[in-house]
Structures are given as C-alpha cells and as structure tokens.
Interface confidence: low
C-alpha cells in the first residue's frame, strides 16, 4: 500500500439547519482516474462509516440515494457536505481517500475534522 497525504480542516461548526461542509484535499502521487472517498466518524473510540462514494475524475461524486452526504470534486479536492446533523452527531469526521485506478493503489487518511453540532433553541411560545 502506498501512503498518500490527505488534508482537511481541524474544526467545522454545523449550521443551524444541521449542515456541515468541509474540503478534503489529497496529494495525488500520479494520474488517478478512479477515486473512492469515505467519511468515517470517530466518537468514543468507535469508528463508523458515514458515507462513501466512488467517482471518475472529472465526474460528480455519487453517493447512495439515502446518504446524508453530498459532494463535488475539483482536481485533487473533494467538497463534502453532511446533512441532517444533530447535537448527538458531534464528533471527529475523518476523510479517507483511495486512488483505485490506475495502479499502484494509494490510500490516504486525514487527521479528521471535528464537527460541532448545536441543536437550535426551540422557538418560545407566542401569545399572538
């Protein structure tokens, strides 16, 4: 396995609508035509897969229809957006990038982006 550097922001604050976006950038060691991006969530020493997409360079990322993730790619950057987040989803979101084709296979794992999610305050009861 060939190691590859992956960079991502240290901290991101989700919007009041529970949406968080961040850029995952990888240092491609060569010409890659097929790339797989996986978002992992680490919380309480547990790591779970949030979403994953394989894309051909120059094409859009395609996540599963029921995925909470969307994304776009531009060169060696992937712009990831995670939706539907709640306070309980606060945690470290790790970007894993695999250059699937052509060989040799490269794997890169970022240090993670700490996403803070604050549930919005409920609206006060109105008298009118």
């Amino acid at each position: 396995c060939k190691a590859m550097h992956v960079a991502q922001p240290a901290v991101v604050l989700a919007s009041s609508r529970g949406i968080a976006s961040f850029v995952c950038e990888y240092a491609s060691p060569g010409k890659a035509t097929e790339v797989r991006v996986t978002v992992l969530r680490q919380a309480d020493s547990q790591v779970t897969e949030v979403c994953a997409a394989t894309y051909m360079m120059g094409n859009e990322l395609t996540f599963l229809d029921d995925s909470i993730c969307t994304g776009t790619s531009s060169g060696n950057q992937v712009n990831l957006t995670i939706q539907g987040l709640r306070a309980m989803d606060t945690g470290l979101y790790i970007c894993k990038v695999e250059l699937m084709y052509p060989p040799p296979y490269y794997l890169g794992i970022g240090n993670g982006t700490q996403i803070y999610v604050i549930d919005p305050e409920p609206c006060p009861d109105s008298d009118f």
């Epitope: 396995c1 097929e34 052509p102 060989p103 040799p104 296979y105």
Partner: antibody, heavy 120, light 107 residues
Framework: EVQLVQSGAVLVKPGASVKVSCKAS????????MNWVRQRPGKGLEWIGM????????SLNQAFKDKVTITADESTSTAYMQLSSLRSEDTAVYYC?????????????WGQGTTVTVSS | DIQMTQSPSSLSASVGDRVTITCRPS??????LAWYQQKPGKAPKLLLY???NLADGVPSRFSGSGSGTDYTLTISSLQPEDFATYYC?????????FGQGTKLEIK
C-alpha cells in the same frame, strides 16, 4: 471478443535489439493497462512493466529498466516492447497481458506469447 | 519489492484428489492477489482474482481463500485437465511479482 495477437518468434544475435508487438482487438485499447511478462525456458513468470495507451504512461520493473522500452500506438491498437543489447539470458517467451480496469486487479487476457531466441 | 513464496514447488496427485497450494507474500496484500493456471506451451489463464473471486468460465472446483500474508488455492476434486503449473501474483503496487510456481503432476 477480446484478442491479443503477438508477433512471431524471432532469432537474434547477441548485442542486437528486437521489437515485439501485441495487437489488441475487441475492446477499447486506450482504457486498459497493457502489461509485459517474461518467461525463461523452464522458469516462472516475471513482470516486466506496463503502459497505459491513452497517454503512454509507463511503469517499469526496475530490474528491466536498462533492457526494455515499452510503447503503444493508439491508431493501430498495438503495444510494443523493445529489448536492447540482447544476451543469451534474454532468451525467453514474452507475453503481453491486459489488466482489468478496477480494483482488485488481474491480468484477464493474454497474448499467445512471442519466443525470442538470442544466439550467435 | 514484495516477494511471493509459493509452496509446494511441485505436487503429485490423482484424479479426484483435493489439492491445496499456498502463497505467502512478504507483506500484507489486502487480498490483492490473483491465481493463474499455465499449461505447457500456452499462455497463463486467470483463475481467481481478489484472492477469492472466480474468473469467468472457471469451474467451481477451484476456490481461493486468505488475507494478509497467507493465501490458498484449492482444487476440490482434481480433473485430468487440471494438471498444469499454477502461479500466484500480487497486484499491490508495482512491480507485480509472481510466485515461483507449483507444478501439479499426475501420481
């Protein structure tokens, strides 16, 4: 039907060069890596290197870097391997082999082999 | 470079026997391993890829297993046409080295 057809057997003198061809048909030549493999008489298989015909990017086994040049002609869907400064130990059967496009990889189609005999 | 140690180098067996060939790479291949069959005077033929996936048209008596640094090719019931030489190959970064081969002969 995918086919890889290699050039015929050759007898060459020590010190000479030879160019072996591999004509591909039945698939999109520019979207697959083409590999070359050596098999000396009675011995095993050795990976020489590969070329991606779309832009002629090559990856070569360092053990063959001073011996082999790999090229490809997109217009004729043909891959070539040139062997230089031939010696008796270069006597072998040389195969071309297509590599599958997705991970996990494999060599799915092979040419019939070209016998190169180096002798004075 | 990754070294591929294949064993045994030769093997005598009878029709109907169950045969196992082992391949041990010098480092973890993460199942990026293929098996080929070669008969005298012929090009190698793909049997399995990704350690366990049967190639198109290959009989189900052939199977592959393993992970990490330990891989196995099994022929559940030898047929006359199975007597040949078998090679493993890693495809985990270049150079894509092969095992030294296992020659399967009739007992």
């Amino acid at each position: 039907e995918v086919q890889l057809v290699q050039s015929g057997a050759v007898l060459v003198k020590p010190g000479a060069s030879v160019k072996v061809s591999c004509k591909a048909s039945g698939y999109s030549f520019t979207t697959y890596w083409m590999n070359w493999v050596r098999q000396r008489p009675g011995k095993g298989l050795e990976w020489i290197g590969m070329i991606h015909p779309s832009d002629s990017e090559t990856s070569l086994n360092q053990a063959f870097k001073d011996k082999v040049t790999i090229t490809a002609d997109e217009s004729t869907s043909t891959a070539y391997m040139q062997l230089s400064s031939l010696r008796s130990e270069d006597t072998a059967v040389y195969y071309c082999a297509r590599m599958g496009r997705r991970n996990p990889y494999y060599f799915d189609y092979w040419g019939q082999g070209t016998t190169v005999t180096v002798s004075s | 470079d990754i070294q591929m140690t294949q064993s045994p180098s030769s093997l005598s067996a009878s029709v109907g026997d169950r045969v196992t060939i082992t391949c041990r790479p010098s480092e973890n291949l993460y199942t990026n391993l293929a098996w080929y069959q070669q008969k005298p005077g012929k090009a190698p033929k793909l049997l399995l890829y990704g350690a366990t996936n049967l190639a198109d048209g290959v009989p189900s008596r052939f199977s592959g297993s393993g992970s990490g640094t330990d891989y196995t090719l099994t022929i559940s019931s030898l047929q006359p046409e199975d007597f040949a030489t078998y090679y493993c190959q890693h495809l985990w970064g270049t150079p894509f080295t092969f095992g030294q081969g296992t020659k399967l002969e009739i007992k």
